[in-house]
């Protein structure tokens, strides 16, 4: 009787334990499958594309972006797949030859046709944003600016893409979209903290980077200042991105891009020239170039220096002296007048600089050419290198950089000097804060610049609120997979023990 009772108990217990083990294994397997499948949904990858044309003052560039459709609102999923530089000058130079605009855009638009799958053409948006070169043309004549844009629109409408229009963006937009671009690419809008960083400039904190953009006709500075209140509402922007509020300062200095700054400097210096020879410290010794006075006064940027000269042309003769060039450049910045607590120059409000800055576009191109983009190069070293570079004879420079177009090559001394002057005297960076400037060309394969931010905004890909994230973070996913795998392993071991050594397992159960 006792034996029967004992065997019944054993049978009951073993059945229950087997049932529990079986149930646990099934749960673990289901959990593993569920977690695995939820996390790694085998959806057909639906890729979307977007095209933005940056119609700058000196040239036009076409950028193609792609992103997975399912992750449209995620941060950091859009990346650049192609950049095509249009051959020729900026669109504002086509005012006398608008009939050539169609041909001008052909190569890059055809390249876009090749890169983007044909099935996607009709749903790929195309945006063209024109910047300071066209702002200057519009300042001279709205009719001429309209005419250029009309022809551009007609040309772009002939392609199979979803053309969304061509417009002149404001300086504020240019600054803001550049700021959005670099912070998006640096992962600053992501609310998840990372255990490791794959972005070279990325600090683990979520503090945004400031943006320093230099073009041919304008320059922009945009950052989140420490003090939330602003003395100048014109320079204040409010964003809500991914559930967080940002109070941003931005200003665009029209005519202070590197090319227009050079025209300004020449117009200023020729005023005091005794004859038609301009000895210029911003060009290498031995460099010579003839400039038409009519070209000098063509731009509104030189209007304040305009005067009747006793000659139609003058010759620039380089003398290659960094210090004198620096002094000449400083005269472009009026720092004598400031109606605010602090100004950049020309009476424009500038709050105290805060945090790290990404300096891109021509800031990067020029400093990269001069080999001065390294984080380790101090401001003093940069100045030293510039002194050395500017004093090199023109013939020597031409030999050393035989592959570089002379027009560009001749201007690196001025451009480098101008960048230093703008950053130090214009924006008030110091030798100490210089290390907070990071000269950036690309971030994870995407060019730093306003175009990505512009497209993200126009395609509504930056939500105001933090979107519902993927079902699990990577760490939670790994943890759950390990946990359920362990459960399965333990269940398997216990099962083996039960069936191989049952007496050992039951011996104390009476």
């Amino acid at each position: 009787m006792e034996d029967t009772k004992e065997s019944n108990v054993k049978t009951f217990c073993s059945k229950n334990i087997l049932a529990i083990l079986g149930f646990s294994s099934i749960i673990a397997v289901i959990a593993l499958l569920a977690v695995g499948l939820t996390q790694n949904k085998a959806l057909p990858e639906n890729i979307k594309y977007g095209i933005v044309l940056d119609a700058g003052s000196s040239h036009t560039s076409l950028y193609i972006y792609k992103w997975p459709a399912e992750k449209e609102n995620d941060t950091g999923v859009v990346h650049q797949v192609e950049e095509c530089r249009v051959k020729g000058p900026g669109i504002s130079k086509y005012v006398q030859k608008v009939n050539e605009i169609g041909i001008y855009l052909t190569d890059c638009m055809e390249r876009a046709r090749e890169v983007i799958p044909r099935s996607q053409h009709q749903e790929t948006p195309v945006y063209l944003g024109a910047t300071a070169g066209m702002r200057l043309l519009r300042m001279e004549s709205e009719e001429l600016a309209d005419r250029v844009l009309d022809v551009v629109e007609r040309s772009l409408s002939n392609y199979p893409f979803d053309f969304q229009g061509a417009r002149i963006i404001t300086g504020q937009e240019e600054g803001a979209y550049g700021w959005i671009t670099i912070n998006y690419l640096l992962g600053k809008f992501s609310q998840k903290t990372r255990w490791f960083s794959i972005v070279p400039y990325e600090t683990n904190n979520q503090e945004t980077f400031g943006a320093l953009d230099l073009g041919g006709a304008s320059t922009q500075i945009t950052f989140v200042p420490q003090n939330q209140t602003t003395e100048s509402p014109d320079n204040a922007l409010q964003f809500r991105l991914y559930g967080k509020d940002y109070n941003v300062y931005t200003h665009s200095f029209l005519c202070y891009g590197k090319d227009q700054a050079l025209w300004q400097k020449l117009a200023k210096d020729i005023q005091v020239a005794s004859n038609e020879i301009l000895r210029d410290p911003c060009f290498h010794p031995g460099y010579k170039k003839v400039v038409n006075v009519s070209d000098l006064y063509k731009t509104p940027c030189t209007k304040r220096f305009e005067m009747t000269l006793p000659f139609q042309q003058f010759e620039i003769q380089g003398i290659g002296n960094y210090q004198q060039c620096h002094q000449s450049v400083l005269e472009l910045f009026n720092t004598s007048y400031c109606p605010y607590s602090q100004c950049a120059f020309n009476g424009i409000f500038l709050p105290p600089l805060q945090g790290d800055f990404g300096a891109f576009s021509a800031f990067y191109f020029v400093m990269n050419f001069l080999n001065l983009t390294s984080e380790k190069v101090s401001q003093e070293k940069v100045t030293e290198m510039m002194k050395k570079f500017c004093s090199q004879p023109w013939e020597e420079i031409k030999t050393s950089y035989a592959g570089v177009k002379e027009k560009y090559l001749s201007e690196y001394c001025f451009s480098g000097t101008y960048i230093l002057s703008l950053l130090l005297q214009g924006y008030h960076f110091t030798a100490d804060s210089w290390e907070h400037i990071h000269f950036i060309g690309k971030i994870q394969g995407s060019d730093a610049g306003w175009t990505l931010g512009y497209m993200l905004n126009l395609t509504n890909m930056i939500p105001a609120e933090q979107p519902l994230s993927t079902p699990l973070s990577h760490s939670t996913y790994v943890f759950l997979m390990v946990l359920f795998s362990l459960v399965l392993v333990i269940v398997a071991i216990i099962g083996l023990l039960i069936f191989h050594k049952p007496s050992y397992f039951w011996k104390d159960m009476v």
Partner: antibody, heavy 116, light 111 residues
Framework: QVQLVQSGAEVKKPGASVKVSCKAS????????MHWVRQAPGQRLEWIGY????????TFSQKFQGRATITVDTSASTAYMELSSLRSEDTAVYYC?????????WGQGTLVTVSS | DIVMTQSPDSLAVSLGERATINCRAS??????????MYWYQQKPGQPPKLLIY???NQGSGVPDRFSGSGSGTDFTLTISSLQAEDVAVYYC?????????FGGGTKVEIK
């Protein structure tokens, strides 16, 4: 929306100077030139000159060269037109107008009366 | 200076009828394929209002009954069907070169 608001009417004696202001809003002040145009009673519109607010450079009609001065205060988004050595024939409504070559936006006008 | 000559000096048109104003420039006001010719409407006590720019483009908010044509030196403003609110003085202007000049004006009234 773009708005240009001018200062009030002025009465001046011959030989004196007058300074009319034009406060702009609704756009980036330094992105467009500011022109000044006047209209004497029953007369055609007459262009005085313009300023590039970006840098303060200005251009005038030969008729007003040396007598008219146009200035700006970019921090206040305001343009000013000063006319000196006033004579009775300067009695007119003075307008500011925004534009490069297209005067799409005008101030409401400021009546300047020159009378002894 | 480019002289702008408007004709007629005044014009009386019945409501719903067509009104045509001409403007002749002393030299071509075309440049880079654009006519730097503008038409403005001015009512008593008000600043001028831009009607037509670039000779033939309508200003924003301008009724379709206003149209402009011409190039070079000869230009026309047409009001296809005159309305009571169109009673005003109309001016042409060139901005091809400094000094920018205006026509003498055409007074439009209802017959």
């Amino acid at each position: 929306q773009v708005q240009l608001v001018q200062s009030g009417a002025e009465v001046k004696k011959p030989g004196a100077s007058v300074k009319v202001s034009c406060k702009a809003s609704g756009y980036t002040f330094t992105d467009y030139n500011m022109h000044w145009v006047r209209q004497a009673p029953g007369q055609r519109l007459e262009w005085i000159g313009y300023i590039v607010p970006l840098n303060g450079g200005s251009t005038f009609s030969q008729k007003f060269q040396g007598r008219a001065t146009i200035t700006v205060d970019t921090s206040a988004s305001t343009a000013y037109m000063e006319l000196s050595s006033l004579r009775s024939e300067d009695t007119a409504v003075y307008y500011c107008a925004r534009g490069g070559t297209r005067f799409a936006y005008w101030g409401q006008g400021t009546l300047v009366t020159v009378s002894s | 200076d480019i002289v702008m000559t408007q004709s007629p000096d005044s014009l009386a048109v019945s409501l719903g009828e067509r009104a045509t104003i001409n403007c002749r420039a002393s030299e071509s006001v075309d440049n880079f394929g654009v006519s730097f010719m503008y038409w403005y409407q001015q009512k008593p006590g008000q600043p001028p209002k831009l009607l037509i720019y670039g000779a033939s483009n309508q200003g924003s908010g301008v009724p379709d009954r206003f149209s402009g044509s011409g190039s070079g030196t000869d230009f026309t403003l047409t009001i296809s069907s005159l309305q009571a609110e169109d009673v005003a003085v109309y001016y042409c202007q060139q901005t091809k070169e400094v000094p920018y000049t205006f026509g003498g004006g055409t007074k439009v009234e209802i017959k």
